[in-house]
């Protein structure tokens, strides 16, 4: 009985095809395989970012493969090709590992590359960025913004910076047809005559940097003796009522001073009879059935009433 | 429509240089190997040098080792071959072809240009 | 090297007829064979892979067979634009080679 084998796939190879770090894993199929005509072939491939402890294993028939990488570090991959037992009458069989690596030679020391990078999706709407230069670069040294992400077919560049000195410190994106819950792909590169500039790549989803405006017409009304019913609307833009999370901070007579989250656009707060006025404040976030993060918007303006007035045009 | 348009064939002195370029389109270039393969005037057809889809293996034929050096450009969607110490054996009709690949089997040809003319003559 | 060995430089036949063209490997390529047509004044194009599959929009009247060493392609039914030069080609391990051609011929 002759021992069956099969060979790894050939050319195995990491494919940069400039989207910042989304990348193709891409390989041919094994020497000899019209052996195994009748059979599907399969492939275990298994990658990481170098200096992850644990590897992404995916088993697919095909002879490609795609995701994001985190290009500030290099990438590496290895596949084989397994050999189902109704194959072979027996037991799995695999091939050696075939290998690939990839990473982007880095140019300039870590220092030069932008600092304290931050993204904030405006009201689900506007995209800005903001950084700040590398430590120790002079006034010469300029930063470009790049992005990708699925639905564009080529990586574009900022062309709306914000500049302070001559200098690009942040970049007003235009609007971004498709672009949330995927990743979003950004490389800051840089250039200066005196000395290279180390490039910064960064991977989020829209849906989880959404700062939105903080909500509208607040209103008060008293339900009943002790109970008052806080209200508000939603902020203006497209962000749907169902992905809205509220923090409201209620001052009773400046004193009380009570901070609740709930979820939708009212709230019903009990008193007692000692209260003469109450002011509340309140602010908007994308709840978690809509993002798995976000930020919290900018307070409302403060509203304040006194009881006293409330209770007459109740009974009014 | 799948389109391989080459250019740069010319005619050359022995000794002498040259690059050809191979414009792809219709097709996700950078998904496929490439390949040059020639036809000399006896009508014989002869594989120069393959590289494959993302450019980190290259394979070529005995009798241009050391002398032609194939490359793409997968922003560009262009193939290259740059031919040097040029001889007389390598007057032919250059043409970039794709590599075909299915779940068994690869190394063969499924898409041809129309081919540019290469003459080495003193 | 893999030579590939295509035995008749040319094949004389009428449309309609059924022809075979063989082509020998001189060592075991399994059916890694590939069959090209080179019509006058154009580039070759691909007919067969894997020693059986017709390329993409290939009429059936196109077929190939054969493992190891010995492969043969076969037009069932000729027709008047079938006038070409045919090639094997091995796909199995580099340097991918080709054999030195056929050439068919319409009385």
């Known amino acids: 009985d002759t021992e069956i084998k099969v060979n790894p796939p050939q050319d195995f190879e990491i494919v940069d095809p400039g989207y910042l770090g989304y990348l193709y894993l891409q390989w041919q199929p094994p020497l000899s395989l019209d052996n195994f005509k009748e059979c599907t072939v399969e492939y275990e491939l298994k990658y990481r970012n170098i200096g992850s402890e644990t590897w992404t294993t995916i088993i697919t028939k095909n002879l490609h493969y795609k995701d994001g990488f985190d290009l500030n570090k290099g990438i590496e991959a290895k596949i084989h090709t397994l050999l189902p037992w109704q194959c072979t009458n027996g037991s799995e069989v695999q091939s050696s590992w075939a290998e690939a690596t990839y990473w982007i030679s880095p140019q300039g020391i870590p220092e030069t590359k932008v600092q304290d990078m931050d993204c904030v999706y405006y009201n689900w709407q506007y995209l800005l960025c903001s950084w700040k230069p590398g430590i120790g670069v002079l006034l010469d040294t300029n930063y470009n913004l790049f992005y990708w992400y699925e639905g564009l077919d080529r990586a574009l560049q900022c062309v709306d910076y914000i500049k302070v000195d001559g200098q690009n410190i942040g970049c007003r994106f235009p609007y971004l047809e498709s672009s949330d819950y995927k990743d979003f792909y950004i490389c800051v590169n840089g250039s200066s005559e005196t000395k290279p500039i180390r490039s910064s790549y960064f991977t989020f989803q829209l849906q989880n940097i959404v700062k939105p405006l903080p909500p509208v017409c607040l209103t008060c009304t008293q339900e009943s003796l002790y109970e008052i019913k806080l209200k508000w609307s939603i902020p203006l833009g497209p962000i749907p009522a169902r992905c809205f999370v509220y923090e409201i901070e209620i001052r009773e007579d400046d004193t009380t001073l009570v901070t609740t989250t709930v979820e939708n656009e009212t709230y019903t707060l009990k008193i007692t009879n000692e209260t003469r006025q109450l002011c509340f404040v309140v602010r908007s976030k994308v709840n978690i059935y809509c993002s798995d993060d976000g930020i919290w918007s900018e307070w409302s303006d403060k509203q304040c009433w006194e009881v006293e007035e409330l209770l007459k045009k109740t009974l009014l | 429509e799948v389109q391989l348009v080459e250019s740069g064939g010319d005619l050359v002195r022995p000794g002498g240089s040259l690059q050809l370029s191979c414009a792809a389109s219709?097709?996700?270039?950078?998904?496929?190997?490439m390949s040059w393969v020639r036809q000399t005037p006896d009508r014989r057809l002869e594989w120069v040098a393959t590289v494959s889809s993302g450019g980190s293996y290259i394979y070529y034929a005995d009798s241009v080792k050391g002398r032609f050096t194939i490359s793409r450009d997968n922003a560009r969607n262009t193939l290259y071959l740059q031919m040097s110490s040029l001889k007389s054996e390598d007057t032919a009709m250059y043409y970039c072809?794709?590599?075909?690949?299915?779940?068994?089997?690869?190394?063969?040809?499924?898409?041809w240009g129309a081919g540019t003319t290469v003459t080495v003559s003193s | 090297d893999i030579v590939m060995t295509q035995s008749h430089k040319f094949i004389s036949t009428s449309v309609g007829d059924r022809v075979s063209i063989t082509c020998k490997a001189s060592q075991d390529v399994g059916t890694a064979v590939a069959w090209y047509q080179q019509i006058p004044g154009q580039s070759p194009k691909l007919l067969i892979y894997?020693?059986?599959y017709r390329s993409t929009g290939i009429p059936d009247r196109f077929t190939g067979s054969g493992s190891g060493t010995d492969f043969s392609f076969i037009i069932s039914s000729v027709q008047a634009e079938d006038l070409a030069l045919y090639y094997c080609q091995h796909h199995y391990s580099a340097p991918w080679t080709f054999g030195g051609g056929t050439t068919l011929d319409i009385k």
């Open positions: 219709g097709f996700t270039f950078s998904r496929n190997g």
């Open positions: 894997s020693a059986s």
């Open positions: 072809a794709r590599q075909g690949t299915t779940a068994l089997a690869t190394r063969f040809f499924d898409v």
